[in-house]
């Protein structure tokens, strides 16, 4: 028997749900009262989802996993798991056994995608030409940990003096704050984008100033 | 008939080598997953390590990882164990064994003696 | 140690009804199924019963397994002289990804 999974990760939005794929080739006269089917955690080997004798044993995790039933006598191992969750991120092995045995893993990459920046400036009043400032980029809720570039209104990056920070918090996702400090020229935009690396999705804001008042 | 014959037992002293081999016959030998089970003097069996049909995947008990290496050709019906570093605690008989649904074992050979001392 | 724990030890007289018992773990037992050999004195080990419950050919029907969550149990009813011999559970343990066996019970008939 020869198990396949997909060699690409499978990527999962938070709170969604996954399907990992797993495959093997049931010989003629095949039945299901001869399948034996693991799906457990690859480094941990901590058992997720079971199938022997003949029944579906039922997830042994979070009771969010499910087989497909009526797909398994053709052959489809393949595991759902619900409503993801950040720590659900990792490799899967799926083990067959019938009179033969084999196994593959597949990788779960969870994501969530990061919120419309919001841009804050310290001082927000009576700025003038020269004046130093701090432009805050924050940005919320998303995973993996995110990457921040800065740009100036002519498209320059903007490198130095910044200092990017990242929480997570009780689910795991990521809050960013991305501090710009500059001198401010006679009027200038700055724009920050967070971008998701697993999403390649970009959240953008950038602040305009152009002496009185600011523009968000 | 369905049978598995073990050769290649014998006394040798720690730290020596050994291959142990299983022919097969009545059945198609490349069709199944394949076990090396063992049994010390008096003791209870210990499975040693197992074999898929191809030899894509393989398993170890965690005593004989590193040591001992399984592995099998198809074109001649044989099994083998490769037996290296070996210790007075590899003393045993040592089964051949045909995989069956369920993870069971449906057919083992009659055995053969591995004895390891100085 | 063995993963599977079996009494060392079990007797009946001919006629009676034995069980031996195998007590797993959600990763093996729990996970997968059972399998019992019987081991006559100076033989190799022969396969009893598969997948907790059913019987290769030309096993008597004397000879039944079970399971219930993480254990299982071999009952031999009708008990005969011959059954005397070493019997072994064993499962494939999914957090070792090993196959595992019980440490034998020898049983005597008296």
């Known amino acids: 028997v020869e198990v396949q999974v997909s060699e690409d990760p499978v990527v999962a939005l938070v709170d969604t749900d996954a399907t990992l794929r797993c495959s093997f080739s049931p010989e003629p006269g095949f039945s299901l009262a001869q399948l034996n089917l693991i799906w457990q955690l690859t480094d941990t080997k901590q058992l997720v989802h079971s199938f022997t004798e003949g029944r579906d044993q039922g997830s042994a995790y979070s009771n969010r996993t499910a087989l497909f039933p009526d797909l398994l006598v053709q052959g489809n191992a393949s595991l759902r798991l619900q409503r993801v969750r950040v720590t659900d991120e990792g490799s899967y092995t799926c083990f067959v056994s019938i009179q033969d045995f084999d196994s593959a893993a597949v990788s779960l990459q969870v994501a969530a995608p990061y919120s419309k920046p919001s841009m804050t400036l310290e001082p927000n009043k009576d700025l003038r030409p020269g004046n130093m400032v701090t432009i805050t980029c924050s940005s919320y809720q998303g995973y993996p940990e995110a990457e921040v570039f800065w740009k100036d209104g002519q498209g320059v990056p903007l490198t130095g003096n910044v200092t990017t920070s990242q929480m997570a918090n009780e689910r795991g996702l990521f809050d960013v704050h991305s501090v710009l400090r500059v001198v401010l020229g006679a009027n200038g935009t700055y724009s920050c984008l967070v971008r998701n690396p697993v999403l390649q999705q970009d959240a953008h804001g950038s602040v305009t100033i152009t002496g009185q008042p600011l523009t968000f | 008939e369905v049978q598995l014959l073990e050769s290649g037992g014998g006394l040798l002293q720690p730290g020596g080598s050994l291959r142990l081999s299983c022919a097969a016959s009545?059945?198609?030998?490349?069709?199944?997953?394949m076990h090396w089970v063992r049994q010390a003097p008096g003791k209870g069996l210990e499975w040693v390590a197992a074999i898929n049909s191809d030899g894509s995947r393989i398993y170890y008990a965690d005593s004989v990882k590193g040591r001992f290496t399984i592995s099998r050709d198809n074109s001649k019906n044989t099994l083998y164990l490769q037996m290296n570093s070996l210790r007075a605690e590899d003393t045993a008989v040592y089964y051949c064994?045909?995989?069956?649904?369920?993870?069971?074992?449906?057919?083992w050979g009659q055995g053969t003696t591995v004895t390891v001392s100085s | 140690q063995s993963v599977l724990t079996q009494p060392p030890s079990a007797s009946g007289t001919p006629g009676q009804r034995v069980t031996i018992s195998c007590s797993g773990s959600r990763s093996d037992i729990g996970a997968t199924t059972v399998n019992w050999y019987q081991q006559l004195p100076g033989t190799a080990p022969k396969l009893l019963t598969y997948q907790s419950h059913l019987r290769p050919s030309g096993v008597p029907d004397r000879f039944s397994g079970s399971k219930s969550g993480t254990s299982a149990s071999l009952a031999i009813s009708g008990l005969q002289s011959e059954d005397e011999a070493d019997y072994y559970c064993a499962s494939w343990d999914a957090s070792l990804n090993t196959w595992v066996f019980g440490g034998g019970t020898k049983l005597t008939v008296l």
């Open positions: 009545g059945f198609s030998f490349s069709s199944y997953g």
């Open positions: 064994t045909k995989y069956y649904y369920h993870y069971a074992m449906d057919v």
